[in-house]
Amino acid sequence: SAPGEDEECGRVRDFVAKLANNTHQHVFDDLRGSVSLSWVGDSTGVILVLTTFHVPLVIMTFGQSKLYRSEDYGKNFKDITDLINNTFIRTEFGMAIGPENSGKVVLTAEVSGGSRGGRIFRSSDFAKNFVQTDLPFHPLTQMMYSPQNSDYLLALSTENGLWVSKNFGGKWEEIHKAVCLAKWGSDNTIFFTTYANGSCKADLGALELWRTSDLGKSFKTIGVKIYSFGLGGRFLFASVMADKDTTRRIHVSTDQGDTWSMAQLPSVGQEQFYSILAANDDMVFMHVDEPGDTGFGTIFTSDDRGIVYSKSLDRHLYTTTGGETDFTNVTSLRGVYITSVLSEDNSIQTMITFDQGGRWTHLRKPENSECDATAKNKNECSLHIHASYSISQKLNVPMAPLSEPNAVGIVIAHGSVGDAISVMVPDVYISDDGGYSWTKMLEGPHYYTILDSGGIIVAIEHSSRPINVIKFSTDEGQCWQTYTFTRDPIYFTGLASEPGARSMNISIWGFTESFLTAQWVSYTIDFKDILERNCEEKDYTIWLAHSTDPEDYEDGCILGYKEQFLRLRKSSVCQNGRDYVVTKQPSICLCSLEDFLCDFGYYRPENDSKCVEQPELKGHDLEFCLYGREEHLTTNGYRKIPGDKCQGGVNPVREVKDLKKKCTSNFLSPEKQNSKSN
């Protein structure tokens, strides 16, 4: 079981006094309704809190919202509702915060039914001041900032118009009508789908994909017969209807839609779907739904072109379109992903990959843990992680798995130990090595967060009763101390810390309920005095990621290189600090066949690492073509796994073959593409 507060734990001296001096209460002059919170910028300390209260009347809903601002990480708040003229803000649009440290904020107001357009409040000084702007349209979506220029905004209207602003929402221009979906690409490019006849729903599968690179001055049709499209990393994906039937197929472009290639993926029918699970500039994880209402599909991983796909994981749990999947990128260690599969007996099991989808395995049973009732063999079982699916099923799981890039190796999650996910009350488990090994961290469900790049972990018990105790650990969850942050318990609603896990402040949100009133209240605790000194060189130790067998010459090699990290010693109670940068040292590994995937036209026979040519491509479900400037495909049968950096060692050179004769497809070719000017 998890270590508790005992003599074995290195207690932080005088922590009660230190935390008491750094606990800040703020009672909001508000009736309980809903509250949303946003950080404005990085390391600015600015938080905006929007409270909304609905009173459903017979004919209409009367609403009231209040806006509060903090510039000290939530220790103090100021009511700034007057800056937005006491207007009711629409919570479904949230607070649109500008990219990086632009200091921009857009709030969308509720307007009366008869008005010509909507209303927004804009700030470009971290919410110190707001400007009211009346819109010439009613927004359907939140304002979307261009990632490259925060002055450029786009929005869809309730009448399917695509509206663009070049001066941070001051002036708006409708650049296209009949638009279903619009997204910013790179370099201020906008991609969008349009319908010609009826509506977005009626024309699904007959939409056109358009692109504008000059904010609507000119357009280019880059795809037809489109069902939907998506962006991931440097890839643009379109799901395209087949000529002959109602199936559709994924096409991919790496040049913003100028040229397309058919992805070597199965086609899907009307009831099925594709989903980009994760993508970066190297590769993509794609989920392809199974036919029928199975609730599962197959994960495929792509090559560096996004064209050739290898089957990665069967029976991957993903409920119907827009539903739930447990697919989680473990951001604290390169190459690690966790997800769930639906086994033949309909139980749900957790799987983990350490090599970007190359191989999947069960999670190792935590040390000193016992297998639960789901296990056939009481000595052999594994850890199963609760994620989005469990939360959607209303299991007693308050939080999804948590990892942070700057808290190397740390993964925290709710789980159970057995043969499958259990519906019993879960415990909280922690891994300090990116998911290879696990230990029970806390008994029962908790909310948790990582502070100071892993230097502190904070947790609050998930309970239906009011709470007044917070737990914290300075040694990656081995030992815990408890701190009573208020005499009067509150109904807890959420734990908030600045995104990025660099902060040392945590805000506990909740409400107090007396006989007649309920009020929002927040407690912000600053842990700076717990971690009194700055960490020095002696506080860190060297750790090799992905190490499984030190006797193996290539121990730690994943995707062609191994990485050593400087990690905080568990016994060191010190501040990593806001400017902490993960220190790592990569070293290149020798290549083996494991570093290559089979190119199009080749496959790996079971239990063989060599790629063998497929006897006949034609008639295969998995076929693809390359369109564009290069009209033939040459391959040596192997292709380096995306992101793999190995050198030397095995170099599988094969005779180059021209496979163009074996290729057929039906997607838009360059000569069919047309350009239009506005």
Epitope: D475, Q478, C479, T541, I542, P550, E551
Partner: antibody, heavy 124, light 106 residues
Amino acid sequence: QVQLVQSGAEVKKPGSSVKVSCKASGGTFRNYAISWVRQAPGQGLEWMGGIIPIGGWANYAQKFQGRVTITADESTSTAYMELSSLRSEDTAVYYCARQGRKTGYYYYYGMDVWGQGTTVTVSS
Amino acid sequence: DIQMTQSPSTLSASVGDRVTITCRASQSISSWLAWYQQKPGKAPKLLIYKASSLESGVPSRFSGSGSGTEFTLTISSLQPDDFATYYCQQADGHITFGGGTKVEIK
């Protein structure tokens, strides 16, 4: 079976330097940290520092910082410890030892293989 | 640096005795503690790592326990070959050794 073989005994004058070598055979030298530990006559064990051959990451005990340099040559599977500004108190047996490793942490599992020791005598 | 205090410094015992040596760390080191045996003129030999894990090839009469700041090495039934000096060593800070415990014949 992994073995660590150290260079022979040395007699040095105060103020000079000594460089002791430690050659590994029969194992994957690069994947383990090598520590250097000394023992003065009739005294206990004292850790001086260690090195990880991959990347050459060295770290030193505060007491020896600035006076000791630990290096490793992966191609010959050899670690070296150089101690400068020698004084009579540096007279000791110097051991190299491999840090056992069960996980990615290099220094947490004790020293499972030791060299035979090198006697360094500092005398004028 | 973390200080390691070993006690007793000398211990007289007879063959067959149960022997206990303790080691205290100046701050919590979790379970990152090792125990060594050293005989005159020889290099130390690893007995226990991670506070309680027995190194392969070490007789099962040796056992380790503890975590945090208090640790114990126990020899359940002292054998003639066990008369030696024993050292604890912490590994969670820059490595430091305890002062040693000499187990001699009573």
